[in-house]
Interface confidence: medium
């Protein structure tokens, strides 16, 4: 996504020759290169840049379409409800909004990867901030869902159900506020930076090495480790309680939320492991050499693509794992008069049509 201006060494002419003559990808870089300027050439980025140019635009375009359709469907289903949304459904609606906003920025990054950033510094800051706001929001909202379920099932405390309806909204507002705070560096340090020799402009960070490392640590901790720990803790306790109570219906009801969390972990763990390697190289704990740097750059592109795939995955999970979601989607299509559904007046199998399609509360255990 956003190009990071990592603190490159000064490139010497042996390397420029490789870059200009287009054989940099076959240039032999050992694993034990020193940091000195000229005894070993610093790292060319041609391979990772060419990889990004080929791989990212196609991936981002696909994710943009899938994410927009899927999350649009989720939002439509939730907003078509005649009754008030449950706490989990409210969080899921916010999650759909976060994912939609994130995928809306993908076409911009696709253009940036394919050609250059043509949208100016203002949109660079906004798109970068929007991207990170929604990256953090997705993770934190999943943590909120798991905490809500934890209170509900383990402590039999329906924090949002019995309290004022504003409580869940306030929680969501707090999440968005926190994400805005996390995105401040984007507003400050992101800009459309012109590479004079390549005659290309890219949306990238311009800040010192220490700031870059700090931001990555924040992303790793706040956007991944903390939410994942909260989810793991909450669901471990929930499953323990449900197994002890032999609540098979409850376990079935937990299925979707657990699958969503597992999907989050599977999608984002590879990316954050790569970021961790990068942090360790920044801190000098891992030796930085061209071979490793190039592999990290490519791995970052691939794993971040897998991470962004998570935005499109939630709607699919709801569709395939959530029975109620399928039913409500079907009803919505009927109500909209979908041409190929018009003649069929099929009724959903559940009689509790207004119960939550994701909630694992006393009101609806079979909803998934």
């Amino acid at each position: 996504m956003v190009l990071e201006v990592s603190d490159h060494q000064v490139l010497n002419d042996a390397e420029v020759a490789a870059l200009l003559e287009n054989f940099s990808s076959s240039y032999d870089y050992g694993e034990n290169e020193s940091d000195s300027c000229c005894t070993s050439p610093p790292c060319p980025q041609d391979f990772s840049l060419n990889f990004d140019r080929a791989f990212l635009p196609a991936l981002y375009s696909l994710l943009f379409l899938l994410g927009l359709l899927g999350n649009g469907a989720v939002a439509a289903v939730l907003l078509s409800r005649r009754t008030a949304l449950s706490s989990t459904d409210t969080f899921l609606l916010h999650l759909a909004v976060a994912d939609t906003l994130l995928v809306l920025t993908l076409p911009l990054w696709a253009v940036d990867a394919a050609v250059q950033w043509v949208f100016g510094s203002g949109l660079c800051k906004v798109a970068g901030a929007l991207f990170n706001i929604n990256f953090y929001a997705g993770a934190l909202l999943l943590a909120c869902i798991s905490f809500d379920r934890y209170l509900n099932i383990v402590h039999a405390t329906q924090l949002y159900r019995r309290g004022p309806p504003a409580r869940v909204t306030l929680t969501c507002l707090a999440v968005w506020g926190l994400c805005l705070l996390f995105a401040l560096p984007d507003f400050i340090f992101l800009s459309a930076h012109h590479d004079e020799r390549l005659n290309a402009t890219h949306c990238q960070y311009n800040f010192p090495q220490v700031g870059r490392t700090a931001l990555r640590v924040l992303q790793l901790v706040a956007g991944f480790l903390l939410p994942l720990l909260v989810m793991a803790y909450c669901y471990a306790h929930i499953l323990a309680v449900l197994l002890v109570s032999r609540g098979q219906r409850r376990l079935r009801a937990m299925r979707l939320v657990v699958v969503v969390v597992v999907a989050f972990a599977l999608c984002w763990t590879p990316y954050h492991l790569v970021v961790l390697v990068d942090i360790l190289m920044d801190l000098g704990a891992l030796a930085r050499n061209c071979g490793r740097e190039s592999r990290v750059d490519v791995a970052k592109s691939v794993t971040s693509g897998l991470g962004y795939m998570h935005c499109c995955l939630n709607p699919l999970l709801y569709a395939f794992v959530g029975v109620k979601f399928r039913e409500r989607m079907w009803m919505l299509l009927l109500r909209l008069g979908c041409p190929n559904q018009r003649g069929l007046q099929r009724q959903p199998s559940s009689s509790r049509r207004d119960s939550s399609w994701s909630e694992t509360s006393e009101a609806s255990y079979s909803g998934l």
Partner: antibody, heavy 123, light 106 residues
Framework: EVQLLESGGGLVQPGGSLRLSCAAS????????MSWVRQAPGKGLEWVAT????????YYPDSVKGRFTISRDNAKNTLYLQMNSLRAEDTAMYYC????????????????WGQGTLVTVSS | DIQLTQSPSFLSASVGDRVTITCRAS?????LYWYQQKPGKAPKLWIY???TLASGVPSRFSGSGSGNEYTLTISSLQPEDFATYYC?????????FGQGTKLEIK
């Protein structure tokens, strides 16, 4: 418009110290590697020190290694050269220069230069 | 260290003349860079990557060469071209400059 303004030069005794500054404006200072290049009176140019844009990597020729230290304050858009154990042969006009970017890396040549600050080492 | 030797060190020429300055490297270099310096002024980047003219440099200037020998050529000397020209290499550390060629009006 790219501008580099050196300051801090002057007369100093052999063995003494001096700190040169270079205030940068007109470009994103944090994105560029920077260098100091000197020119003894009536003589040619000599590269003195280079620092990568984030300050992680620094390079020196053997003639100044261990005596000179290049550093930068990106918050202040300022480049520094701390010169210790000065010798008569360090007498020169000291120029601050910017490295251009190519393919995301920093080149060894210089696309913009300041007007220089004169350092005289004499007893 | 790679030594760069410029020849001639001094060159007297007239407006309209074709002038060639040579820069020889003690061992092969990948590219050569040229700077122009006028008295009391800072050097200016003139040619980079051996033959690419820097922004604002007139097309009468050209650069060529490879390996150990490089040249800067002015096809038709103009009054504003009288200055000192330095070559520089960045193939191996330390970055070194030639001693300079002073171009004077005949």
């Amino acid at each position: 418009e790219v501008q580099l303004l050196e300051s801090g030069g002057g007369l100093v005794q052999p063995g003494g110290s001096l700190r040169l500054s270079c205030a940068a404006s007109g470009f994103t200072f944090t994105s560029y590697a920077m260098s100091w290049v000197r020119q003894a009176p009536g003589k040619g140019l000599e590269w003195v020190a280079t620092i990568s844009h984030g300050g992680t990597y620094t390079y020196y020729p053997d003639s100044v290694k261990g005596r000179f230290t290049i550093s930068r304050d990106n918050a202040k858009n300022t480049l520094y050269l701390q010169m210790n154990s000065l010798r008569a042969e360090d007498t020169a006009m000291y120029y601050c220069a910017r490295h251009p970017i190519y393919s995301g890396n920093y080149q060894g040549y210089f696309d913009y230069w300041g007007q220089g600050t004169l350092v005289t080492v004499s007893s | 260290d790679i030594q760069l030797t410029q020849s001639p060190s001094f060159l007297s020429a007239s407006v309209g003349d074709r002038v060639t300055i040579t820069c020889r490297a003690s061992s092969g270099v990948n590219y050569l860079y040229w700077y122009q310096q006028k008295p009391g002024k800072a050097p200016k980047l003139w040619i980079y990557f051996t033959s690419t003219l820097a922004s604002g440099v007139p097309s009468r200037f050209s650069g060529s060469g490879s390996g150990n020998e490089y040249t800067l050529t002015i096809s038709s000397l103009q009054p504003e071209d009288f200055a000192t020209y330095y070559c520089q290499q960045f193939t191996s550390s330390p970055y070194t400059f030639g001693q300079g060629t002073k171009l004077e009006i005949k």
